[in-house]
């Protein structure tokens, strides 16, 4: 029951995550205006990934997309790739992850394999989420460096009265929210990759003993709750993992076969 | 074609107060920011006010802020400008417009005469 | 606060004659993060409100003839009337729209020579 619970958390909080992470990398608002020397400028501009904005007092706002690819930024360009491979890693491990709860019945699948699979969309979720943090990362340590740079040279042009003053920008909201959705993604692999370790077969569990009866066999399996009349190969032994859950050898394409509990 | 007009100015005494309105029709009022700009006799523009679209933001220089206050009724689709505290330098000619791209002000009303004269 | 200066404070030009108005700003109006300069142009002739000729320095209002038009960036900016008409004679007034407060400059006399 725990481990179904961590892994249903764990998925949810991934899922978050994710869709935390997507929302962040569409946002315009990576850096936005200081307003620091003007609190009530009439013209704040703010920049995403893909494209910068300016919104007026009058309402209007204007966005130009990034139209060019090698004139930007390497730093632009990693940050893209970090945010747009966590995205990836965390949708396939949300599909991986999907298959591999426990509370979700496809097939005739071995816990063991759905194990495998929670360990894998964990490690996934783990990647992704250190990708997203990453990217935001790198994106604000650019912003700092790029605002220290700008309030040095605050009033470059002072040519008698003239200022020209430098636009300088701060962090905007969406690199909180990567941060945040980045962090969910982490602690939902971590619960995923803990999940996994209640679902694995260990091998100190007992092997199933078999009892042969002379007119057809039947199978009890310690710590299970279901006996299985045979009638074919469906004796070979078998590791219980969980006394409720279906095991292999319990074919469902036989007709006369029944479980009792 | 879009019309504001304005009402309310007239004579008031130093220390006293008044409230103009602007009453906006065939445009969609509640789209755009709105400010005031007054002109006293024989000079420059000089600009009042400005309210954002949505009523959350109020702008306002040094010379009035604290004794003016702008608001606005989207409903109604009408701006006001509560003056209080008027002295004989707020005598002018009171313009309501309203804001398009660039910040410009695009549509102007005919304006209405405020005089503070004891 | 932004301080806007016009000249010359009065212009007289002979009809069909091209007329310039300079206005100059105590601080840059250009906006880096779409580079337009936030600088407007109004026409105002006696007895009227104010008409918007010019928005982002050079950007021409719908209706506005095409005789007019606004050169310039950062401080120093034009408004130019290629051929004058009687029409035009006004008081000029620029605008700074890029920063609270927003300023005015003291206006330019159109005068028929």
């Known amino acids: 029951m725990a481990v179904t619970a961590c892994q249903g958390l764990g998925f949810v909080v991934s899922l978050i995550g994710i869709a935390g992470i997507i929302a962040a990398t569409c946002m315009d608002q990576w850096s936005t205006q200081d307003l620091y020397n003007n609190p009530v400028t009439a013209v704040f501009n703010y920049q995403g990934l893909w494209r910068s904005c300016v919104r007026e007092s009058s309402g209007f706002t204007e966005c130009r997309g990034y139209f060019t690819l090698l004139g930007l930024p390497a730093m632009l360009q990693a940050v893209r790739a970090l945010m747009i491979v966590g995205i990836v890693l965390g949708a396939i491990g949300l599909l991986v992850s999907i298959f591999a709860l426990k509370c979700i019945r496809i097939g005739s699948m071995e816990d063991s394999a759905k194990a495998n699979m929670t360990l894998t969309s964990g490690i996934m979720f783990i990647v992704s989420g250190l990708c997203a943090i990453a990217g935001v990362s790198v994106f604000a340590n650019m912003l700092v460096t790029n605002f220290w740079m700008s309030t040095a040279n605050m009033y470059t042009g002072m040519g008698g009265m003239v200022q020209t003053v430098q636009t300088r920008y701060t962090f905007g909201a969406a690199l909180f929210v990567g941060w945040v959705a980045g962090g969910l993604t982490l602690i939902g692999g971590v619960m995923m990759c803990i999940a996994c370790r209640g679902l694995a077969p260990e091998e100190t569990n007992y092997k199933a003993v078999s009892y042969h009866a002379s007119g057809h066999s039947v199978a009890y399996k310690p710590g299970g709750f279901k006996a299985s009349t045979g009638f074919g190969s469906n004796t070979k032994n078998k590791k219980i993992y969980d006394g409720g859950a279906r095991t292999e050898d319990e074919v469902q394409s036989y007709p006369s076969k029944h479980d009792y509990v | 074609e879009v019309m504001l007009l304005e009402s309310g100015g007239g004579l008031v005494q130093p220390g006293g107060s008044l409230r103009l309105s602007c009453a906006a029709s065939e445009f969609t009022f509640s789209n755009y920011a709105m400010s005031w700009v007054r002109q006293a006799p024989g000079k420059r523009l000089e600009w009042v006010a400005t309210i954002s679209s949505g009523r959350s933001s109020t702008y306002y220089p040094d010379s009035v802020k604290g004794r003016f206050t702008i608001s606005r009724d989207n409903a109604k689709n009408t701006l006001y400008l509560q003056m209080n505290s008027l002295r004989a330098e707020d005598t002018a000619v009171y313009y309501c417009a309203g804001l398009g791209r660039g910040n410009a002000m695009e549509y102007w009303g005919q304006g209405t005469l405020v005089t503070v004269s004891s | 606060d932004i301080v806007m200066t016009q000249s010359p404070d009065s212009l007289a030009v002979s009809l069909g004659e091209r007329a310039t108005i300079n206005c100059k700003s105590s601080?840059?109006?250009?906006?880096?993060?779409?580079?337009?300069?936030?600088l407007t142009w109004y026409q105002q002739k006696p007895g009227q409100p104010p008409k918007l000729l010019i928005y982002?320095?050079?950007t021409r209002e719908s209706g506005v003839p095409d005789r007019f038009s606004g050169s310039g960036s950062g401080t120093d900016f034009t408004l130019t009337i290629s051929s004058l008409q009687a029409e035009d004679v006004a008081v000029y007034y620029c605008q700074n729209a890029y920063s609270y407060p927003f300023t005015f400059g003291g206006g330019t006399k159109l005068e028929i020579k």
């Open positions: 601080q840059s109006l250009l906006n880096s993060g779409n580079q337009k300069n936030y």
């Open positions: 982002w320095a050079s």
